[in-house]
């Protein structure tokens, strides 16, 4: 379902950060997925194929991500803790045609008792 | 230099986690990069090309990563804090030939004052 559904966990917790999963249909071959916090684009990942079927991945905002055949997961290690924010994913489908753009289902994420938890001392 | 060098920062700090960068020569087209903590393999990423030059990425340990044309960066969001550990990268080169395996330069990572810093309350 291109409009997204609630049958997957959009947010999952990792020490000090959150993984946000943006689902898309397995039939989609080429796409752009953007993660928004309110109106701000936090992450953008584009997967396209060339004329010889070679795959190119563009990650211009250098987000940590994991791409599978039906989801893009972005890892935010410093989510905004000032207030509860609404996060949602926006999907552009290039292939198969026709071109489509859809806002997928989103969710509110509220962070509390947030603090810098670790200090690292690095010896090289 | 395939054996690695100290001219890049292997570790970089992110809230609650650490990014470990494994550099490789830009001439390498197909490779396997493994991240070790002491003798334990934490992450493994393989980039290969098929007969049609389509790129395949295998990430069997489902690590968060970023791949560029000269490095693989792994993000560990729960590094072992029990003691200082030695981390190093191991590179297997498939293309260009001949096949080579190299342990790249490593480094000690010591974590202190580690604690669970954030609790997330998730509303979907």
């Amino acid at each position: 379902e291109i409009n997204g559904s609630a049958d997957h966990r959009m947010f999952s917790f990792h020490n000090g950060g959150v993984q946000i999963s943006c689902k898309y249909p397995e039939t989609v071959q080429q796409l752009k997925m953007r993660l928004f916090r309110e109106r701000e684009v936090l992450c953008e990942l584009t997967k396209t194929k060339g004329s010889g079927n070679a795959v190119s991945i563009k990650n211009p905002m250098l987000c940590l991500y994991h791409l599978s055949n039906n989801s893009v997961s972005f890892f935010l290690n410093n989510p905004d803790s000032s207030q509860g924010s609404y996060y949602f994913c926006s999907l552009s489908i290039f292939d198969p045609p026709p071109f489509q753009e859809r806002n997928l289902s989103g969710g509110y994420l509220h962070i509390y008792e947030s603090q810098l938890c670790c200090q690292l001392k690095l010896w090289l | 230099e395939i054996n690695g060098s100290a001219d890049h920062r292997m570790f970089s700090f992110h809230n609650g986690g650490v990014q470990i960068s494994c550099k490789y020569p830009e001439t390498v087209q197909q490779l396997k990069m493994r991240l070790f903590r002491e003798r334990e393999v934490l992450c493994e990423l393989t980039k290969t090309k098929g007969s049609g030059n389509a790129v395949s990425i295998k990430n069997p340990m489902l690590c968060l990563y970023h791949l560029s044309n000269n490095s693989v960066s792994f993000f560990l969001n729960n590094p072992d804090s029990s003691q200082g550990s030695y981390y190093f990268c191991s590179l297997s080169i498939f293309d260009p030939p001949p096949f080579q395996e190299r342990n790249l330069s490593g480094g000690y990572l010591h974590i202190y004052e580690s604690q669970l810093c954030c609790q997330l309350k998730l509303w979907l």
Partner: antibody, heavy 117, light 111 residues
Amino acid sequence: EVQLVESGGGLVKPGGSLKLSCAASGFTFSDYWMDWVRQAPGKGLEWVGNIDHDGNIINFAPSVKGRFTISRDNAKNTLYLQMNSVKSEDTATYYCARWGHYAFDSWGQGTLVTVSS
Amino acid sequence: DIVMTQSPSSLAVSAGDKVTINCKSSQSLLSSGYNYLIWYQQKTGQAPKLLIFYASTRHTGVPDRFIGSGSGTDFTLTITSFQTEDLGDYYCQHHYSSPPTFGPGTKLEIK
């Protein structure tokens, strides 16, 4: 309106070099893979090579591999084909084409390259 | 490399004729439910124009008399009622793998 305009063709001696350009307009150039396709006089179409959005992935036909290079300047919306060590069989009209995700959906008018001594 | 063949190499036709052009690939072009096969039209002195992609999907603005069909290794471009403006060369092309290759072409001429 999508427009692709090739330039740089002409007469070149065997073993010589030539650089073709393709100026793109009417679309977001950096969003697309771009290709070069050639057509020898009175013959069919032959794919030459392609380049991805950022120039990280470049592929070539076996007939030109090692002699031709493809590059792009996204700031200038321009695609390039550098032809080195040219042979008589490289004589052709060279088209730049936009790969529209599942086909070449836009082509330039072509530029003729003649390799002759 | 995948080899593409076309038949016939040329065909003399009249207005209103049903025209059939065949294209064959040396290996299957079917993947994930899609056939990676394209048809182009090229008129004399012009650049090629996209007609059909994924073997059977008409490109925007292409008249519905152009029909693509087939799957796997055997494909057909049919012009249900030939018009004089359809004169030119027709090429099939695969994009299943690299290098993407074209068929040798089929020339349509007036009878």
